[in-house]
């Protein structure tokens, strides 16, 4: 049975040309995780793996970087960057749990984090 | 320029154990993975596993762990598979290749083994 | 482990046509796909990755496309020299598996 839960940054602004980092937490689960996959709609952004370490995708490199933790850092925003944003956890014996992020990148500096919230 | 170079044809008999290397060139090793992958005659090809010679670290397909182990030596920038037991259905090419997690970039040769009494 | 499935392991085609090829992932691969050509006592060679990047110094006749489960691979004009298998893979988790390999060959 999946026990865990999956805790994000939740909803999120950022400003244009700015940068941004992407948080999940695993939690309530004995599971061991073999990768973590960052997806932004229908493109892999980077992924962790438990084994080999961190790979970022070749289209990605110049503004995707590691970390911290299992997290994610967009860099150079651009309005084009607005939109969900899911980590896959990967994890032995349960199965994958996946977390949701919704970015909106904004032109002003009125830019604010969101609260954080859980996605069982 | 890029180039894995591998160790040459083995005829070995069953039951004994081969190691395959391959050489790298013209990069840095310790930058991307090592990935193998076989192919039986008239076959398509099967990924084995992969290591990251920087980490040590490996990764294998559930079915040759126990047949397949995985090392890297970076002072020589070269990356070895040892394949144990050996039994008629390890006859296969084998290749090695530079990865990027994301694709296979540069290949090695091929190592033929034939595994015979 | 995530099966990748080319449902034709034989095309026949001609030069200059468009020939395409599918394959289809067991579950979610984003567009964590690669395809490679693998020509007869040759080692496989790159041409796309990420499901629609050619890779450096593959030729424009080539061209991938697809996300999720379903992927193709196109040749808009072949030619002679594409005589080869060619296979997807998946790089969305380990292990990195292959399809089956689809055999073009020309009439």
């Known amino acids: 049975m999946m026990t865990g839960t999956i805790e994000t940054t939740g909803n999120i602004s950022a400003e244009k040309g700015g940068s941004i980092i992407l948080q999940c937490h695993l939690s309530s689960t004995t599971a061991q995780v073999t990768q973590v996959n960052w997806e932004q709609q229908d493109q892999l952004l980077a992924i962790c793996n438990a084994d080999l370490g961190w790979h970022i995708s070749p289209s990605f490199k110049d503004r995707v970087a590691p970390g911290p933790g299992l997290g994610l850092t967009l860099q150079s925003l651009t309005v084009n960057d607005t939109g969900e944003y899911f980590c896959i956890y990967h994890t032995y014996p349960d199965g994958t749990y996946t977390g949701r992020i919704f970015l909106e990148v904004l032109e002003s500096s009125v830019a604010e984090h969101g609260a954080r919230f859980q996605i069982p | 320029q890029v180039q894995l170079q591998q160790s040459g044809a083995e005829l070995v008999r069953p039951g004994t154990s081969v190691k395959v290397s391959c050489k790298a060139s013209?990069?840095?090793?310790?930058?991307?993975?090592i990935e193998w992958v076989k192919q039986r005659p008239g076959q398509g090809l099967e990924w084995i596993g992969v290591i990251n010679p920087g980490s040590g670290g490996t990764n294998y397909k559930e079915k040759f762990k126990g047949k397949a182990t995985l090392t890297a030596d970076k002072s020589s920038s070269t990356a070895y598979m040892q394949l144990s037991s050996l039994t008629s259905e390890d006859s296969a090419v084998y290749f090695c290749a530079r990865g990027e997690y994301f694709f296979f970039d540069y290949w090695g040769q091929g190592t033929t083994l034939t595994v015979s009494s | 482990d995530i099966v990748m499935t080319q449902s034709h392991k034989f095309m026949s085609t001609s030069v200059g046509d468009r020939v395409s090829i599918t394959c289809k992932a067991s579950?979610?691969?984003?567009?964590?796909v690669a395809w490679y050509q693998h020509k007869p006592g040759q080692s496989p060679k790159l041409l796309i990755y990420?499901?629609?990047y050619r890779y450096t110094g593959v030729p424009d006749r080539f061209t991938g496309t697809g996300s999720g489960t379903d992927f193709t691979f196109t040749i808009s004009s072949v030619q002679a020299e594409d005589l080869a298998v060619y296979y997807c893979?998946?790089?969305?988790?380990?292990?990195?598996?292959f399809g089956g390999g689809t055999k073009l060959e020309i009439k």
């Open positions: 579950q979610h691969v984003s567009n964590g």
């Open positions: 893979q998946q790089h969305y988790n380990t292990p990195h598996t």
């Open positions: 990420s499901a629609s």
């Open positions: 013209g990069y840095a090793f310790t930058n991307y993975l």
